[in-house]
Amino acid sequence: ATKLTEEKYELKEGQTLDVKCDYTLEKFASSQKAWQIIRDGEMPKTLACTERPSKNSHPVQVGRIILEDYHDHGLLRVRMVNLQVEDSGLYQCVIYQPPKEPHMLFDRIRLVVTKGFSGTPGSNENSTQNVYKIPPTTTKALCPLYTSPRTVTQAPPKSTADVSTPDSEINLTNVTDIIRVPVFN
């Protein structure tokens, strides 16, 4: 089994977690991908997922989480904006591949969010000045209801139906982060 490793990433309240999860292009380009949190003693919980099949460069927003899947680059970009202390925890990117178990991408991220925003006057990330709000056309994808155990040798999801429950997402408002699509050469 692959050794599960994690990397600590520490940010302040109000900041944005911005990570890139790599995947094998040939195998997973159009597969549905998800961002999960793993709480102690619990199974991973899906917070947001891409569409099924995943669309190229098409932002999906669930609350303060934005997912963008770049098929040409084998890369899922995950952003959690306006971080709160309560967001601290262990996160991972996974690929849904029913009937097989979800495939974990990269190392897990141990996010630590501390009090106190680091911004200078007039340059707050959450300022309403010069802010590009996420367009209303952004998709909120439906995620599989169940997620798999925390081990790498996981059992298949109990259900792969495209259903969503209130428990499977973060519903928060006031998303005023500046969102820009990366420019690839």
């Epitope: 520490e10 890139k20 680091s118 990366p182």
Partner: antibody, heavy 119, light 108 residues
Framework: EVQLLESGGGMVQPGGSLRLSCAVS????????MSWVRQAPGKGLEWVSE????????YYADSVKGRFTISRDNSKNTLYLQMNSLRVEDTAIYYC????????????WGQGTLVTVSS | EIVMTQSPATLSVSPGERATLSCRAS??????LAWYQQKPGQAPRLLIY???TRATGIPARFSGSGSGTEFTLTISSLQSEDFAVYYC??????????FGQGTKVEIK
């Protein structure tokens, strides 16, 4: 302990070629994106190229696109930079660097290898 | 391409004094900014990431602040080993990953 060790630098004439290597240890090489960053004598840092981990996607600075090729051998824990059609302005110390925490900032660097392009 | 501009180019400070270095991005990079220290003959060393988080093993006298386009690195009380060149780097838009031109902190 994480270690990155570059080699392959040297003197070459304009239009010539060199292949740099970066042998790494202390982390799961195949999982991480790696980059080459260079520094011309007395100048600042310039990102040159990156190769992602699982996807193997590659990216280049405009100044080297079409001339340099980044690659990796995960079985040998080694990153490479093939440099062709070298120019005088490519003269620099070339560092390989490991990406930190799913993001393109660099927490570990090699000691660098000097490439001198001169006639 | 996002252009990173650092100021001043050179900062002359006495040991024990405070040093304030600035970095400006040509467009917002949110908090996706890192600071590196480089001493002569050595590779750069990561000091700060996420605009304000100290990397492992970095002393508390180093602090970063800012978001969007304006960032600051502060060294509260300069020690002899802090005299070096400091670079900022954005990792919001990629590629390329762009660095500032550097600020040299020298002994006054």
């Amino acid at each position: 302990e994480v270690q990155l060790l570059e080699s392959g630098g040297g003197m070459v004439q304009p239009g010539g070629s060199l292949r740099l290597s970066c042998a790494v240890s202390g982390f799961t090489f195949s999982r991480y994106a790696m980059s080459w960053v260079r520094q011309a004598p007395g100048k600042g840092l310039e990102w040159v190229s990156e190769m992602r981990g699982s996807s193997g996607s590659t990216y280049y600075a405009d100044s080297v696109k079409g001339r340099f090729t980044i690659s990796r051998d995960n079985s040998k824990n080694t990153l490479y930079l093939q440099m062709n059609s070298l120019r005088v302005e490519d003269t620099a110390i070339y560092y390989c660097a490991k990406e930190f925490s799913s993001n393109s900032l660099f927490d570990y660097w090699g000691q660098g290898t000097l490439v001198t392009v001169s006639s | 391409e996002i252009v990173m501009t650092q100021s001043p180019a050179t900062l002359s400070v006495s040991p024990g004094e405070r040093a304030t270095l600035s970095c400006r991005a040509s467009q917002s990079v949110n908090s996706n900014l890192a600071w590196y220290q480089q001493k002569p003959g050595q590779a750069p060393r990561l000091l700060i990431y996420g605009a304000s988080t100290r990397a492992t093993g970095i002393p508390a006298r180093f602090s970063g602040s800012g978001s969007g386009t304006e960032f600051t690195l502060t060294i509260s009380s300069l020690q002899s080993e802090d005299f070096a060149v400091y670079y900022c780097q954005q990792f919001y838009n990629w590629p390329p990953y762009t660095f500032g031109q550097g600020t040299k902190v020298e002994i006054k």
